[in-house]
């Protein structure tokens, strides 16, 4: 039987990683996972990843969605796998924008 797991530091979660900051990895490990969507030069840029240090995500995750950026955060292994951040446009798309996944 595996022994007890004392909490000597904050819990870490496995997160899906998609985007330029991920390098060759498709996952990362951190204290929070995130899924984000931003508009860059008319493109919808989707990214996923993790905040390794809780404070990194504290402000980002509390920022309400704006027409140009939305971030959703979660805590749990692979919790950002099925999360797609949505811009607050109630189903309308911005003219001249297209979807783009940063790989």
């Amino acid at each position: 039987m595996e022994d007890e797991k004392p909490k000597v530091n904050p819990k870490l979660y496995m997160c899906v990683c998609e985007g330029l900051s991920c390098g060759n990895e498709d996952h990362c490990e951190g204290q929070q996972c995130f899924s984000s969507l931003s508009i860059n030069d008319g493109f919808h840029v989707y990214q996923k990843g993790c905040f390794q240090v809780y404070e990194q995500g504290k402000m980002t995750c509390k920022t309400p969605p704006s027409p140009g950026q939305a971030v959703e955060c979660c805590q749990g292994d692979w919790c950002n796998r099925n999360i797609t951040a949505q811009l607050p446009t109630k189903g309308k798309s911005f003219p001249g924008t297209q979807n783009f996944h940063l790989e």
């Epitope: 595996e2 022994d3 797991k5 004392p6 909490k7 000597v8 530091n9 904050p10 819990k11 870490l12 496995m14 990683c17 990895e25 996952h27 990362c28 490990e29 951190g30 204290q31 993790c50 390794q52 240090v53 809780y54 404070e55 504290k58």
Partner: antibody, heavy 114, light 113 residues
């Protein structure tokens, strides 16, 4: 039972390199993050480096950043620390430790001296 | 970077008598998740450290109840109610709040008078 056995320590000249290994057994290695922690002779403990369960995330103390590289091979249940540009102040016993620091190896001594 | 300062550096005690070690942090160790990641470790001569207590006051299974941890924020204490011969060695406090940058106190040597 959980076992961690370090190896690779020894005497090396300043500027030289050394590769430490830690062989793990008695638990599912890939389920745990691992750390290297060192202790200079007669001194206290200093955290050196950390690697996540899959090896995708690595962290280093400022004192070793750019000189040390941590890696792991989950298929072989092994943890490694590649040390280069070694300095006299890197002289220490190097311990590998398993999350959450309740299991430590006996340590391997690294001496950097000309 | 969080700095942990331990006092005293050395604590000579009589067998059966209590001992107390203090650990002061340069900043609060309360994490955003509400927990305080302050642990205590014990190292006997020639051996690796052994984790005794985590999140201020939780004893690891197998650790005798003569060991107790207390404190909050930046000030923490490890108490041994009745020191036994096997308790000699160096005690370290450690913070994990700023993980992965773990930091340790300088250590307190407990020896028998």
């Amino acid at each position: 039972q959980v076992q961690l056995v370090e190896s690779g320590g020894g005497l090396v000249k300043p500027g030289g390199s050394l590769r430490l290994s830690c062989a793990a057994s008695g638990f599912t290695f890939s389920d745990y993050y691992m750390s290297w922690i060192r202790q200079a002779p007669g001194k206290g403990l200093e955290w050196v480096s950390y690697i996540s369960r899959t090896g995708s995330t690595k962290y280093y103390a400022d004192s070793v950043k750019g000189r040390f590289t941590i890696s792991r091979d989950n298929a072989k249940n092994s943890l490694n620390l590649q040390m280069s540009s070694l300095r006299a102040e890197d002289t220490a016993v190097y311990f590998c430790a398993r999350e959450p620091l309740q299991h430590w190896g006996q340590g391997t001594l690294v001496t950097v001296s000309s | 970077k969080i700095v942990l300062t331990q006092t005293p550096l050395s604590s000579p005690v009589t067998l059966g008598q209590p001992a107390s070690i203090s650990c002061r942090s340069s900043q609060s160790l309360v994490h955003s998740d509400g927990d305080t990641y302050l642990s205590w470790l014990h190292q006997r001569p020639g051996q690796p450290p052994r984790l005794l207590i985590y999140t201020i006051s939780n004893r690891l299974s197998g650790v005798p109840d003569r060991f107790s941890g207390s404190g909050a924020g930046t000030d923490f204490t490890l108490k041994i109610s009745r020191v036994e011969a096997e308790d000699v060695g160096v005690y370290y406090c450690m913070q994990g709040t700023q993980f992965p940058a773990l930091t340790f106190g300088g250590g307190t040597k407990v020896e028998i008078k």
